[in-house]
């Protein structure tokens, strides 16, 4: 199970993981105490048939070709959490692990 | 965490799970001994901003709007395995649980 890694200089057109730093301060999300920014990454690129398909199911749907199935798209296939310190709606400070905040791998599904 | 369920008569344009029976016999995939067909389902539809977003990350990438990020697409967000009986490449009969063969829920990611 692998995925491509690219950067802003890459000429890769296929599904790839790109670096992206999310800056909560720039968004004006000041209820987030820490971190103020983190490396989130994102997925972008084309999904040619079979390339980086995460699931056998993706191939089977392509084979069956039902009405309205758009073909696979480049999406996170492995994600990881980050620890965050933030205010909840009741203005209590919460420290917790927030799931699926970082893209570790991209694939076609 | 929920997703929409549709059928061939639905007028829903948003991201939805549709029924699909995969027929291995019709594909000529005779190395699969059993099942000969199974209910796989598939995802199709539009991902308007925030609708059925699986991860907070999806929202953050939209907010950061990096070059080449295409916006979320309708993709499986929950999948389940099926048991299969099949011949491997060495012509041995294998009985095993094959992961991610059935779409249980669709969402935007």
């Amino acid at each position: 199970d692998f995925g491509l890694d690219c950067d802003e200089h890459s000429t890769e057109s296929r599904c790839c993981r790109y670096p992206l730093t999310v800056d909560f301060e720039a968004f004006g999300w000041d209820w987030i105490i820490a971190p103020k920014r983190y490396k989130a990454n994102y997925c972008s690129g084309e999904c040619e048939f079979v390339f980086l398909q995460k699931y056998p199911h993706t191939h089977l749907v392509h084979q069956a070709n039902p009405r309205g199935s758009a073909g696979p798209c480049c999406t996170p296939t492995k994600m990881s959490p980050i620890n965050m310190l933030y205010f909840n709606g009741k203005e209590q400070i919460i420290y917790g692990k927030i799931p699926a905040m970082v893209v570790d791998r991209c694939g076609c599904s | 965490d929920f997703g929409l369920d549709c059928d061939e008569h639905s007028t829903e344009s948003r991201c939805c799970r549709y029924p699909l029976t995969v027929d291995f016999e019709a594909f000529g995939w005779d190395w699969i001994i059993a099942p000969k067909r199974y209910k796989a389902n598939y995802c199709s539809g539009e991902c308007e901003f925030v609708f059925l977003q699986k991860y907070p990350h999806t929202h953050l990438v939209h907010q950061a709007n990096p070059r080449g990020s295409a916006g979320p697409c309708c993709t499986p967000t929950k999948m389940s395995p099926i048991n299969m009986l099949y011949f491997n490449g060495k012509e041995q009969i294998i009985y095993g649980k094959i992961p991610a063969m059935v779409v249980d829920r669709c969402g935007c990611s």
């Epitope: - | 005779d30 190395w31 001994i33 059993a34 099942p35 009986l85 011949f87």
Partner: antibody
Framework: QVQLVQSGAEVKKPGASVKVSCKAS????????MHWVRQAPGQGLEWMGN????????NYNQRFKARVTMTVDKSTSTAYMELRSLRSDDTAVYYC?????????????????WGQGTLVTVSS | DIQMTQSPSSLSASVGDRVTITCKAS??????LSWFQQKPGKAPKSLIY???RLVDGVPSKFSGSGSGQDYTLTISSLQPEDFATYYC?????????FGQGTKLEIK
């Protein structure tokens, strides 16, 4: 509909060989195991073996292993059972039967269709 | 090889009777047991699979039960067309083995 049609009756001398055919129709021949079962006159049923037409993988009853060969012709959807070195106690009706899986476990199947049987008489 | 012992070997009964045929395996066969009906000069016909499941198209007067080593076939109300020979088969292990048969005759 699913059908198995077997070749006609044979009379053979001891020591000879016989090749019984079983022509399948109404389904994808290559994707289902074919079994062979025999029945001596007035006796019970005896399993001889099976073959998977897609790849020709076969499994024989040890009792017959040295004398039996199961083959298929995918182009005509026909299964064959050849028995060599015939003896008088090989006189029997030979049946082919399709193995149908109702589930996915290795033993989750039953015989859903049988051929009409082929009588093989071994006599000097 | 797994031995399948069927009893009785023959049975006389009348139309309308309820009859039971038993099959005992020499070891646990995990309910992988089928029952067949055979009429003279004809191929066997599958009735029951996995010990108690009825094959499509088989009338519900036929029923199967049992687990482990002991299994039974019951015909609830005999009709003239039910007089035949019945066989059990274990498919838990190769080689597959049949019971020796039970001949059901009209009294």
């Amino acid at each position: 509909q699913v059908q198995l049609v077997q070749s006609g009756a044979e009379v053979k001398k001891p020591g000879a060989s016989v090749k019984v055919s079983c022509k399948a129709s109404g389904y994808s021949f290559t994707g289902y195991f074919m079994h062979w079962v025999r029945q001596a006159p007035g006796q019970g049923l005896e399993w001889m073996g099976n073959i998977y037409p897609y790849n020709g993988v076969s499994n024989y009853n040890q009792r017959f292993k040295a004398r039996v060969t199961m083959t298929v012709d995918k182009s005509t959807s026909t299964a064959y059972m050849e028995l060599r070195s015939l003896r008088s106690d090989d006189t029997a009706v030979y049946y082919c039967a399709r193995r149908y899986y109702y589930g996915t476990g290795p033993a989750d199947w039953y015989y859903d269709v049988w051929g009409q049987g082929t009588l093989v008489t071994v006599s000097s | 090889d797994i031995q399948m012992t069927q009893s009785p070997s023959s049975l006389s009964a009348s139309v309308g009777d309820r009859v039971t045929i038993t099959c005992k395996a020499s070891q646990d066969i995990n309910s992988y047991l089928s029952w067949f009906q055979q009429k003279p000069g004809k191929a066997p016909k599958s009735l029951i699979y996995r010990a108690n499941r009825l094959v499509d198209g088989v009338p519900s007067k036929f029923s199967g039960s049992g687990s482990g080593q002991d299994y039974t076939l019951t015909i609830s109300s005999l009709q003239p067309e039910d007089f035949a020979t019945y066989y059990c088969l274990q498919s838990d292990e190769f080689p597959l083995t049949f019971g020796q048969g039970t001949k059901l005759e009209i009294k």
